[in-house]
Interface confidence: medium
């Protein structure tokens, strides 16, 4: 899995007038990392993990950069013609990646009212756009605006690839995000369902990276997908992730069921508790 830095900037307009506020969210290796609030931009590390990466002294730099990006996007939105009445949004998503072989990828994507209308490969400078006429009209509009100011195009948009990678490398140097592996805590609970049945839920939390296998087994055999219900793998705000899987079983058959967890090449098996709750730290 590559290391990645993702900027998500959103600006709004109301009845054709661009609003002063904006929202910027930054994700590092898929984790919520920084947030720049709408009215007053102040980079806010998302949890202790982000603070550890940034260090107190560097927040001003992020604040300055994110504020600048927000202003640029507001100017772009102001140049989108034919804005209809009501509320509209322009979103820019910028992503850069460093792969294990040290190769890099960078891209930039624009969305209007949530619909993708323009993408750029920041390495090859190649632009792509969807086929729909509305998207193409928007895309030409925005591209033309970006090209109008040649100096800006050169110093800002074409430098984004290098800037993003530079920031990513700076964050990685902190050591906090360097290919770490955090094993999950696994917690199995049971609750009454209908008569004669119970629902057993297996929760994994506090793990990194996000890839995990969590499933219920009966007699060591994985249950079919249609008999299990999975939750999304979600960030928990601490630089780690959480998820769950549940299934319904017959009361009295608990001993046959185990929750199987596999993460970063390690695995563990967790029985259904006879009482209400059982918490086990994976002991690798």
């Amino acid at each position: 899995e590559p290391h990645s830095l993702r900027y998500n900037l959103t600006v709004l307009s109301w009845d054709g007038s661009v609003q002063s506020g904006f929202l910027t969210e930054v994700h590092l290796d898929g984790q919520p990392f920084l947030r720049c609030d709408r009215q007053k931009c102040r980079a806010k590390p998302q949890g202790q993990w982000a603070e550890d990466v940034l260090g107190n002294k560097t927040w001003d730099r992020e604040t300055r950069d994110l504020t600048g990006n927000g202003k640029d996007l507001r100017m772009t939105l102001a140049h989108i013609k034919d804005q209809k009445e009501g509320l509209h949004s322009l979103q820019e998503i910028r992503v850069c990646e460093i792969h294990e072989d040290n190769s890099t990828r960078s891209s930039q994507h624009f969305y209007y009212d949530g619909e993708l209308f323009l993408s750029q490969n920041l390495e090859t400078k190649e632009w792509t756009m969807p086929q729909s006429s509305r998207a193409q009209t928007l895309a030409m509009n925005v591209r033309n605006f970006l090209k109008e100011d040649a100096m800006k195009t050169k110093t800002h948009y074409h430098a984004m690839h290098a800037d993003c990678l530079q920031e990513l490398r700076r964050y990685l140097k902190s050591g906090v995000v360097l290919r770490r592996t955090v094993p999950p805590m696994v917690n199995v609970t049971r609750s009454e369902a209908s008569e004669g049945n119970i629902t057993v839920t297996c929760r994994a939390s506090g793990f990194y990276p996000w890839n995990i296998t969590l499933s219920w087994r009966q007699d060591g055999v994985s249950l079919s997908h249609d008999t299990q219900q999975w939750g999304d793998v979600l960030p928990d705000g601490n630089g780690t992730y959480q998820t769950w899987v549940a299934t319904r079983i017959c009361q009295g058959e608990e001993q046959r069921f185990t929750c199987y967890m596999e993460h970063s090449g390690n695995h563990s098996t967790h029985p259904v508790p006879s009482g209400k709750v059982l918490v086990l730290q994976s002991h690798w």
């Epitope: 060591g220 055999v221 249950l223 058959e253 967790h270 029985p271």
Partner: antibody
């Protein structure tokens, strides 16, 4: 390649005990249950029980509960079946098998013939 | 305990013929937990079909399975010489895990 290699044939007297070993390879030993099944000469298959090597949980077929003991040695990735108080009707081929993602018995050992005779 | 009864006990057929083997359960089981195995003389059983109708790895397409509830069927569309063997059904729906007594498919 997934394989389960069992120990060699045994000849035992009535009342004695026998211990059969099963050494899987080609997958993570603790990730799948180990099942034990036996087959008397010319007869069908009979499930003895299974063990989860990771947490050591064992489930027996009730008719073997008093005489069969299933164990694992995680350090050598080996599973064992011990059958005590042997009688002539315990003469059979004993198989170990792996619980699969898609079935209860997806890979089998080659079998161990246990002969009980006075 | 769920008892699986296989029929017929012996099936005498020629290569190229169609074989239909039945497995009847004493009480209803989920189709996810009905499996078929093939065993040749002097060999260990081999997983043939899992969850009623799914072919295990390397099993030829002439084998198929069907059924639900208490009645399940294994079909070999056109017998090949290597198909003559004993076939067992097995249920994993409830403890103890049980096998049928087997159906021997022999050359006529």
């Amino acid at each position: 390649e997934i394989q389960l290699v069992q120990s060699g044939a045994e000849v035992k007297k009535p009342g004695a005990s026998v211990k059969v070993s099963c050494k899987p390879s080609g997958y993570a030993f603790t990730s799948n249950n180990i099942y034990w099944v036996r087959q008397a000469p010319g007869q069908g298959l009979e499930w003895i029980g299974y063990i989860d090597p990771y947490i050591g949980r064992i489930i027996y077929n009730q008719q073997f509960k008093d005489r069969a003991t299933l164990t694992v040695d995680k350090s050598t990735s080996t599973a064992y079946l011990e059958l005590s108080s042997l009688r002539s009707e315990d003469t059979a081929v004993y198989y170990c098998s792996r619980s699969g993602e898609r079935s209860n018995f997806d890979y089998w050992g080659q079998g161990t013939l246990v002969t009980v005779s006075s | 305990e769920i008892v699986l009864t296989q029929s017929p006990a012996t099936l005498s057929l020629s290569p190229g013929e169609r074989a239909t083997l039945s497995c009847s359960a004493s009480s209803s089981i989920s189709s996810n937990y009905l499996h078929w195995y093939q065993q040749k003389p002097g060999q260990s059983p081999r997983l043939l079909i899992y969850r009623t109708s799914n072919l295990a790895s390397g099993v030829p397409a002439r084998f198929s399975g069907s059924g639900s509830g208490t009645d399940y069927t294994l079909t070999i569309s056109s017998l090949e010489p290597e198909d003559f063997a004993v076939y067992y059904c097995q249920q994993g729906g409830s403890l103890p895990l049980t096998f049928g007594q087997g159906t021997k498919v022999e050359i006529k």
